[in-house]
């Protein structure tokens, strides 16, 4: 049998946010139902994780031996602290789209570990704020965006923006 440390060396995690409790659930991406030591996990999910607090989970299973895999869960900031904001100026709305993630509340997570990503059509931007210029008037554009904490996606949003009519004579 392999050690659990080896077997789950490359385990990945998804973070799911509960807006009512303002707590996260970490979903462990494994095929079998593992045990989590002191942290009880139900159906490979670790519940009630506080934003920006690290949690240590000891992963074991009867298909592997000691030592267990110690997984550090780097819990992201609360999702409601981020808002996707349309920053397009009215006078330029016929050919321009501006989108910005606003941090309306502070949090204790290290901002260095946060990555922003926008995808508008086939264009990808790794920025917190994007401005697309020289667009076609009266066209619909879809932009998908996501925020990652330590390379784990924890929130996403999409916006469909229709550019305004062009000025007469343009």
């Amino acid at each position: 049998k392999p050690t659990c440390d080896e077997k789950y060396a490359n385990i990945t995690v998804d973070y799911l946010y509960n807006k009512e409790t303002k707590l996260f659930t970490a979903k462990l991406n494994v095929n079998e139902n593992v045990e989590c030591g002191n942290n009880t996990c139900t159906s490979n999910e670790v519940h009630n994780l506080t934003e920006c607090k690290n949690a240590s989970v000891s992963i074991s299973h009867n298909s592997c031996t000691a030592p267990d895999k110690t997984l550090i869960l780097d819990v992201p900031p609360g999702v409601e602290k981020f808002q996707l904001h349309d920053c397009t100026q009215v006078e330029k709305a016929d050919t321009t789209i501006c989108l910005k993630w606003k941090n309306i509340e502070t949090f204790t997570c290290d901002t260095q570990n946060i990555t922003y990503r926008f995808q508008c059509g086939n264009m990808i931007f790794d920025n917190k704020e994007i401005k697309l210029e020289n667009l076609e008037p009266e066209h619909e554009y879809k932009c998908d965006s996501e925020i990652l904490y330590n390379n784990h996606k924890f929130t996403n949003a999409s916006k469909i923006i229709k550019t305004d009519f062009g000025s007469p004579g343009e």
């Epitope: 920053c87 501006c98 910005k100 606003k102 941090n103 309306i104 509340e105 502070t106 901002t111 260095q112 946060i114 990555t115 922003y116 790794d126 920025n127 917190k128 704020e129 994007i130 401005k131």
Partner: antibody, heavy 119, light 113 residues
């Protein structure tokens, strides 16, 4: 190491122009809003310019509006302050400072660069 | 513009004493979102300012717990429970509620009595 290093300060005559630079390192510059703050010889701190992370929004107090322009080059991790029509009251130590968003705080400051406006 | 007035201008203290600095704004700095963006910075001699407190009472990481901030509306206070030699310098309050018109207080110099 997170660092901001200002440069470009000089002695300039009233009515003259000057461009300050602030080189950022050790962090994802394009994710941070940035500001210029100056300190007068009397040691008063004055906020003089603000720019959003992607350079879309800029703000200035009335004292410098129309004379100062803040800009940034995220590819070069550099913040700029173009100053024109300089007055003696613009004499100060100029600091660049980062602020993760408008509702956050200035958590990292540079060491400053000195601008003297005198004939 | 929001005017931030600090008192006293100079504060002579003995090491180990408590120090209290007041900051008053000319109008309420409670933002419509319910938050009050009042910050305190310390500038030691020959250095750039450093953040101590944000949103009235939140200590920035690494700031000793002898520093505390309080207040609401227009009146705010920074307290240092037991002054140490490394605390000497000029303290500035700052309001970030009226974006984008940020304003600093005039400063309070903490010095040895």
């Amino acid at each position: 190491e997170v660092q901001l290093v200002e440069s470009g300060g000089d002695l300039v005559k009233p009515g003259g122009s000057l461009k300050l630079s602030c080189a950022a390192s050790g962090f994802a510059f394009s994710n941070y809003d940035m500001s210029w703050v100056r300190q007068t010889p009397e040691k008063r701190l004055e906020w003089v310019a603000y720019i959003s992370s992607g350079g879309v929004s800029t703000y200035y107090p009335d004292t410098v509006k129309g004379r100062f322009t803040i800009s940034r080059d995220n590819a070069k991790n550099t913040l700029y302050l173009q100053m024109s029509s300089l007055k003696s009251e613009d004499t100060a130590m100029y600091y660049c400072a980062r602020r993760y968003d408008v509702w956050w705080y200035f958590d990292v400051w540079g060491a400053g660069t000195t601008v003297t406006v005198s004939s | 513009d929001v005017l931030m007035t600090q008192t006293p201008l100079s504060l002579p203290v003995s090491l180990g004493d408590q120090a209290s600095i007041s900051c008053r704004s000319s109008q309420s700095i409670v933002h419509s979102n319910g938050n009050t963006y009042l910050e305190w910075y310390l500038q030691k001699p020959g250095q750039s300012p450093k953040l101590l407190i944000y949103k009235v009472s939140n200590r920035f990481s690494g700031v000793p717990d002898r520093f505390s901030g309080s207040g609401s509306g227009t009146d705010f206070t920074l307290k240092i429970s037991r002054v140490e030699a490394e605390d000497l310098g000029v303290y500035y309050c700052f309001q970030g509620s009226h974006v984008p018109m940020y304003t600093f207080g005039g400063g309070t110099k903490l010095e040895i009595k």
